[in-house]
């Protein structure tokens, strides 16, 4: 007796596809161990076609796939497009070498079958409209046309030109003639379902010179296209359910029992199990649409489908795509955080996972909005102007080779409690799904700044110093300023760094920059934060207005996010004459060109703002004495 | 309403044959697998064989104890289930009972894993 398990007999037709699934015993060495499928020859030899350490046959070559699903203690072998060759014994099994535990699964693959001569077979899918087409002799052309269903040895009309029609037929069965055509008619029937599968026998006339035609109608529901995706990765399910229902609501639902339960539709309902991680997308004139669905879990395997009506609602008689999605928990995708928590006034520093073989592909951040089918605006990325209403206080830190980029949010207001995506113009199943939380603030914020009211004189020597407690101790102090392609790390001086580590003065610990003397171009926003490495903490911002000399009035600063630094001893710190330079960048036209979901932040030109000299941002690390 | 009615249980002599039918109505969908289970008196159901179908495959799964005596057959748009015993032995004597489920969704051993059961017809192999 084996321990691996399987369907012993598997029968199809030829240009079918299988999916033949094995079960093995619950063991690390199992799941662990090499998978394969052979077949069995008359030798006894048992020839690989296809193994889990990525060994693929000729004769298998582009229509074979094996998958270990580990947690499951299982593995899938897919085969498409079946011939008759195909016929004959195989083993599924666990080992180095197929003598290994193993299966015997016999594999049958017939002819698709034959009908008599004077039988048509029309073959639809549920939902569609066959069209049957019934010819006779001219002797019958002022006769009675009529179809009927074949129930055992009677006939049941379905539909006849005395304008008669099968109450079940109602609105679905037309029979008609086609221009000056006098030996033929046709009967269509839309909407088809699987009862109305069966034999139909049309008839001009009465009696034996009646003119009879047999047609055998075949009501397929569509077979489930297998998805093997693993787990926190995405998944798109592409519709095309044709040009007659282009104007028809779409939906997904996901099958359960009996029912099937609409996931998304374009009607505005959505599923909250999916709320933030999914979306809807139109993709032409013709019906065709896609959805979307980020951050997979265990729980999202199961059957899917796709279909058209007028509620938005799964109904009987209209077409169907399906699909059977299933999740694979050995995930090359890293756990990361899916809820992220900040508080009013604070930030939050969140790090997205990336493909690290694709370092050098462009890095994105996007809002999850849940109006009409879903979208996610594009508000930072490594080529991407920041979004309006986010300047100053997004930046994204791109870490290249770490496998990782750190988005960060400061001056939250409660406003941005919502999800976010992150993602990259490479590999598109490394997106993932972030919550973000922001709860009133109860206490001040860690980092504070002074002066309050920032305004700087050209010419001058200005310093802003920034407050940070003893936690922080530790953890590396910086300054940067801030410009659409990010916040540029600037040299500063940290104070509290010179005291012994075992006395620790909250009052005393400062990080300060000076900007010496002060340019026009100095103006603009300044992050104070923390970091440890390539994890950044905590950021606080302040607007830095610049002045001439000559002018008396104040500068108004352009948001109260300054007003949060609360009075504090200013201090010496190291002088930097810092500048930054203009040149232009254009976001990358091609990004989702075939993912429309996810919103360009513009395809205009932007200004990112870079280094140009040594005491700048470009490259260089903060320096902290 | 999804209905399992099982037939053609009895008494039969060690050695002899007999066939099984299941017919199912309701059950939804056109993918779906349909199973024999046996519960022996105070025992547990056991799993016997099964049959799934998507779209125009099948696949049969057979218990180890019944392999190369017993045959799992059926027809997915009429809804039953065949199983033709044969040699059967008084080991075989339980409540045969018919399974069903709208999908081939994991492993067709487990009785967990099928949504819909029949009542149950008795079979009785003695001399």
């Known amino acids: 007796q084996s321990p691996i398990f399987g369907p012993q007999d598997v029968s199809s037709i030829e240009g079918n596809s299988v999916s033949i699934t094995c079960y093995y015993p619950d063991t690390s060495v199992n799941r662990h161990t090499r998978k394969y499928w052979c077949r069995q020859g008359a030798n006894g030899y048992c020839a690989t076609l296809i193994s889990s350490n990525g060994y693929l046959s000729k004769e298998y070559s582009g229509r074979a796939s094996l998958i270990n699903f580990p947690e499951n203690s299982t593995f899938v072998i897919n085969i498409a497009h079946l011939t008759q060759e195909d016929t004959g014994s195989y083993k599924c099994g666990l080992g180095t070498t197929n003598r290994g535990l193993f299966f015997d699964v016999s594999l049958e693959v017939s002819q698709v079958p034959e009908f008599p001569n004077d039988t048509h077979v029309y073959t639809k899918d549920i939902g569609r409209t066959v069209t049957i087409e019934c010819r006779f002799k001219e002797g019958n052309a002022h006769s009675k046309k009529s179809l009927c269903k074949k129930r055992g040895e009677a006939c049941e009309v379905v539909i006849d030109s005395t304008e008669y029609v099968d109450p079940s037929y109602k609105d679905r069965a037309i029979l008609f003639m086609k221009g000056t055509s006098r030996d033929i008619f046709y009967v269509n029937i839309s909407h088809l379902i699987p009862s109305d599968a069966g034999l139909y026998v049309c008839q001009a006339g009465e009696g034996p010179s009646a003119d009879k035609n047999n047609a055998d109608l075949q009501v397929l529901e569509p077979e489930p296209e297998l998805l093997y995706k693993d787990l926190r990765s995405s998944v798109t399910f592409e519709c095309d359910l044709g040009r007659e229902v282009a104007n028809d609501a779409k939906y997904l639902c996901r099958k359960n029992k009996e029912t099937c339960d609409v996931i998304i539709n374009t009607l505005g309902k959505r599923d909250p199990a999916f709320e933030g991680r999914i979306l809807l997308t139109p993709r032409d004139d013709n019906g065709r649409f896609s959805v979307l669905i980020t951050g997979l879990r265990k729980e999202d395997a199961g059957h899917y489908q796709c279909g058209a009506h007028s509620s938005g609602l799964p109904q009987e008689g209209w077409p169907v795509q399906a699909w059977q999605l299933f999740v694979n928990e050995e995930s090359t995708i890293p756990n990361s955080r899916s809820v992220v928590k900040g508080v009013t006034g604070g930030s939050v520093a969140i790090v997205c996972p990336y493909n690290p073989k694709e370092s050098s592909s462009l890095k994105y951040w996007c809002h999850w909005e849940a109006d009409e089918n879903g979208r996610c605006p594009v508000l930072v990325g490594t080529q991407a102007l920041v979004q309006e209403g986010y300047e100053g206080r997004l930046a994204l830190f791109d870490q290249p080779g770490s496998g990782a980029y750190t988005v960060i949010l400061n001056q939250l207001t409660t406003q941005d409690s919502g999800f976010y995506w992150c993602l990259t113009d490479g590999d598109s199943r490394w997106r993932t799904t972030i919550e973000l939380q922001v709860a009133e603030a109860t206490k001040k914020p860690d980092l504070e700044v002074t002066p309050q009211n920032a305004t700087a004189v050209i010419g001058e020597t200005f310093t802003i110093s920034c407050h940070y407690p003893c936690k922080f101790y530790s953890q590396e102090k910086y300054w940067c300023k801030w410009s659409n392609d990010g916040c540029h790390i600037l040299p500063s001086h940290d104070e509290g760094a010179r005291q012994s580590s075992v006395s620790c003065d909250q009052s005393s610990q400062i990080v300060s920059m000076t900007l010496n003397p002060v340019k026009k171009e100095d103006e603009g926003w300044y992050w104070c934060g923390v970091k440890e490495g390539q994890v950044y903490g905590e950021t606080t911002a302040i607007y830095v207005a610049v002045e001439e000399r000559t002018r008396g009035s104040p500068h108004i600063n352009p948001t109260d996010a300054n007003a949060r630094a609360k009075d504090a001893p200013e201090e010496e710190a190291m002088e930097s004459s810092v500048r930054e330079d203009e040149n232009k960048a254009n976001l990358d036209p091609r990004l989702f060109a075939d993912e429309r979901e996810i919103q360009n932040a513009g395809d205009q030109a932007q200004e990112n703002r870079a280094s140009g000299n040594a005491g700048s941002a470009g490259g260089q690390s903060g320096s902290s004495k | 309403e999804v209905q399992l009615v099982e037939s053609g249980g009895g008494l039969v002599q060690p050695g002899g044959s007999l066939r099984l039918s299941c017919v199912a109505s309701?059950?939804?969908?056109?993918?779906?697998?349909m199973a024999w289970f046996a519960q022996a008196p105070g025992k547990e159901r056991e799993f016997v064989a099964a049959?799934?179908?998507?779209?125009?495959?099948?696949?049969?799964y057979y218990s180890d104890s019944v392999k190369g005596r017993f045959t799992v057959s059926g027809d997915n748009a009429k809804r039953t289930l065949d199983l033709q015993m044969k040699d059967l032995n008084p080991e075989d004597t339980a409540l045969y009972f018919c399974a069903a489920h709208p999908n081939d969704d994991g492993d067709p051993r487990i009785s967990g894993n099928y949504q819909y059961w029949g009542q149950g017809t008795q079979v009785t192999v003695s001399s």
């Open positions: 049959i799934a179908w998507r779209g125009r495959t099948s696949y049969k």
């Open positions: 309701g059950l939804p969908g056109s993918s779906s697998r």
